[in-house]
Amino acid sequence: SGVFQLQLQEFINERGVLASGRPCEPGCRTFFRVCLKHFQAVVSPGPCTFGTVSTPVLGTNSFAVRDDSSGGGRNPLQLPFNFTWPGTFSLIIEAWHAPGDDLRPEALPPDALISKIAIQGSLAVGQNWLLDEQTSTLTRLRYSYRVICSDNYYGDNCSRLCKKRNDHFGHYVCQPDGNLSCLPGWTGEYCQQPICLSGCHEQNGYCSKPAECLCRPGWQGRLCNECIPHNGCRHGTCSTPWQCTCDEGWGGLFCDQDLNYCTHHSPCKNGATCSNSGQRSYTCTCRPGYTGVDCELELSECDSNPCRNGGSCKDQEDGYHCLCPPGYYGLHCEHSTLSCADSPCFNGGSCRERNQGANYACECPPNFTGSNCEKKVDRCTSNPCANGGQCLNRGPSRMCRCRPGFTGTYCELHVSDCARNPCAHGGTCHDLENGLMCTCPAGFSGRRCEVRTSIDACASSPCFNRATCYTDLSTDTFVCNCPYGFVGSRCEFPVGLPPSFPW
C-alpha cells in the first residue's frame, strides 16, 4: 500500500487558448484531471487502473500552484494504491477550462480541453521528487512526482506490512526494508522474548522482562545455577533439585548412615562391579555373559537363536557355534550353497550365477519379489499414494486416484490454498471449499497458528511416585517435587539408587 504524489508547480498558457485554438472568455479558468495507470508501451486513453484525481480551478491562463491547499484542493495530489507497487507507471495529465462551477466531465463542453500530456516509465519507491516539464505548442506544465509507502508499509514495493509495537505481542520498531528491529533487551522472531540477565542459566532460570533472572523450583543463586538439595541432606550433594546424592560410604535418605557393604563382604562374583546402595544393601553390575543378583549365573549365547536357515546352536566357552544344514554355510548359516543348476528361482524368475557359480541371484518378473521370487508383489501394499489418494492396481503398473486439492503421480502435489504453507509453527493446513483451515500443534492457536498459547506441561503426568508437578507457564516446562524417599528429575529413583541403574 502506498501513494503516488503529484505536485503541480506551474502552468503557462500565455495566449489563454483551448486545444482547439479558440480563446477562453474571459480567460482559461484552469483545473486538472490526472489519470494514473500501469505501464503501457503506447499510453492509451483507457481506464485509469491505478486511480484518478481532479483539482478545483487553480488559476487563470498562466499561474504557479502553491504547495499547500489551493481553493480546497490538495497539492501535492494524492493517488493512493493498495497493491504492490510494480515499479512502472503511465501518467496522463489533462488541463481543462471550466466555464462555470460544475467540473464534472458530463457538464463540460467537449472542446473545453486546454492540453493533455502523457508520460510513462520506471519509478522506484522513495522520498525524492522527480521534476518534469512538458511543453506543447501553446502551453507548458511544470510538475514533480514520487511514490511513497503508506504508514506501516515498507520495502521496494510497499508490500511489507510492519507496525511498531511495545506490548505482549512484541517489542520492536520497523527498519526501512520492513524487517523488525527489536527494542533493547528483547529478542526472537517477533521480539517477544526478553533477554535475561547475562549468564542466567538457560534451563534453570527464566525472565519475564529484560535483565532479570528468576529461578525455577529447585534452583537458587543469582544465575540460578545452584541446585537445592533435599531438605536435611547431610553427607550428600545434588546435581538436580531435591536430590541427596551421598558421598562415598554414606547412605540413608539424608546420607547420614555409614555403609560400605561392598568393601567388607565382596558379594559380587565373576568380576562384577559392586556398588553400595543403602544400609547392608548393594548392587552388582555383571560382565557380559553373566546374570543373577551376585552375577553368579552364566548366560547361554544361544538363547538369542543366532543360527539361520535351520542351523543348530552350540555353546562354547568363548561364545557359540552354528552347525549348518546341507546347502548352507557361514557364521550364522546365512549363505546358500545352491547354484542355478538347482533351479532355485520361482515364478519364472531368471537365475544369474555369481562368484564363479558359487552363488546365484534371481531376477524376478514384474509382480514378484524375494530372494527366490517366491513373493507376489501387491503394488499397493507400500501405500504409495500420498494425501489420502486411493491406490488402484492397473496390470503391471499402478495409479493413484487423488482427493480434491491434490495432483501428481502419487498425489504428492497440492493444488490448493495450502500450496503457500499458510499455517505457522508447524500447523497442518486443510483445504475447504471456501478457503483453508489450520489445525495447530499444542501451544499455538489463531486462524494461522500464529498465536503462542501456554501448554500445561503437567498434563501428561510426567512425575512418578505421587510427586507434585509444577508447570512454568513462561517456558512450558515442568518440575517435579518429590515425596519423601524419592529423587530424580521425575522422582523416578528411590533414595540411594544412582540414576545409572534404573531398576
Epitope: H38, Q40, V42, V43, S44, P45
Partner: antibody, heavy 121, light 111 residues
Amino acid sequence: DVQLQESGPDLVKPSQSLSLTCTVTDHSITSGYSWHWIRQFPGNKLEWMAYIHYSGYTHYNPSLKSRISITRDTSKNQFFLHLNSVTTEDSATFYCAGSDYSANEGAMAYWGQGTSATVSS
Amino acid sequence: DIVLTQSPASLAVSLGQRATISCRASESVDSFGNSFMHWYQQKAGQPPKLLIYRTSNLQSGIPARFSGSGSRTDFTLTINPVEADDVATYYCQQSNEDPWTFGGGTKLEIK
C-alpha cells in the same frame, strides 16, 4: 499460444441471471493482459461488455454497468461474467477475449470460440 | 458513444484485385499521437480475428496483403491482392473513448 474457452447455459429464462465462465490456458490471467467479454447479436452486431485487468481492476460498458459484473478465480485461471435481469434482447453469442494491455489496449488479439445463450421463457 | 460507420456494407472483388473498406468515426479516435482504431476479420462460424491494431500495425501472423491507414475520424483497411481465403466480414473497432465500439461490418465476396 494463449487459448480461451467459454462455458455457460444455452437457455436462460427472462428476469434470471446469466453466468458465463472463461477458462484461459497457456497464460496466467494475473500477468500483463486484460480479459474481456464481447457479445454478438443475431444480426452480427458486436458489443464490448466489460474487462478485468490483470491487476484485478474491472471496467464496464456504461450501458450495462447496473446489471453486469466481472470476477475471476486466479487459482483456476478463470474469469466470469454475471449478467442480471436478462431479457430476450440479451440473446447472443458471448465471446471471451484477451489483449496485451501494455502494447495495444483495446485491440483483442486472443478470442474463444464463443458460447450461444438464448433468453426465452 | 462513438459511432463507427463502415462502407460499403458488402463488397465483391475479383481474385488478385485490391479491396478497400472504409470506417468513419463520429468523433476523433486520436490520443497522444496515436489513432486507437483496430480491424478484425470474422469468417462464418468463427470468432473475430485481429488483423490490424492502432490503425496500421500488422498483428503477428497476418500476411502483408493486409494494411491499414487513416487518422482522427477516417480510416481504411486495404487487402491487396485479394485471395479466396479472404472471404469474410470485416469489422473496425475503436478504443479511444469509453465504451469501446465496433462498426457494423463489411462483407467481402469474390466475383
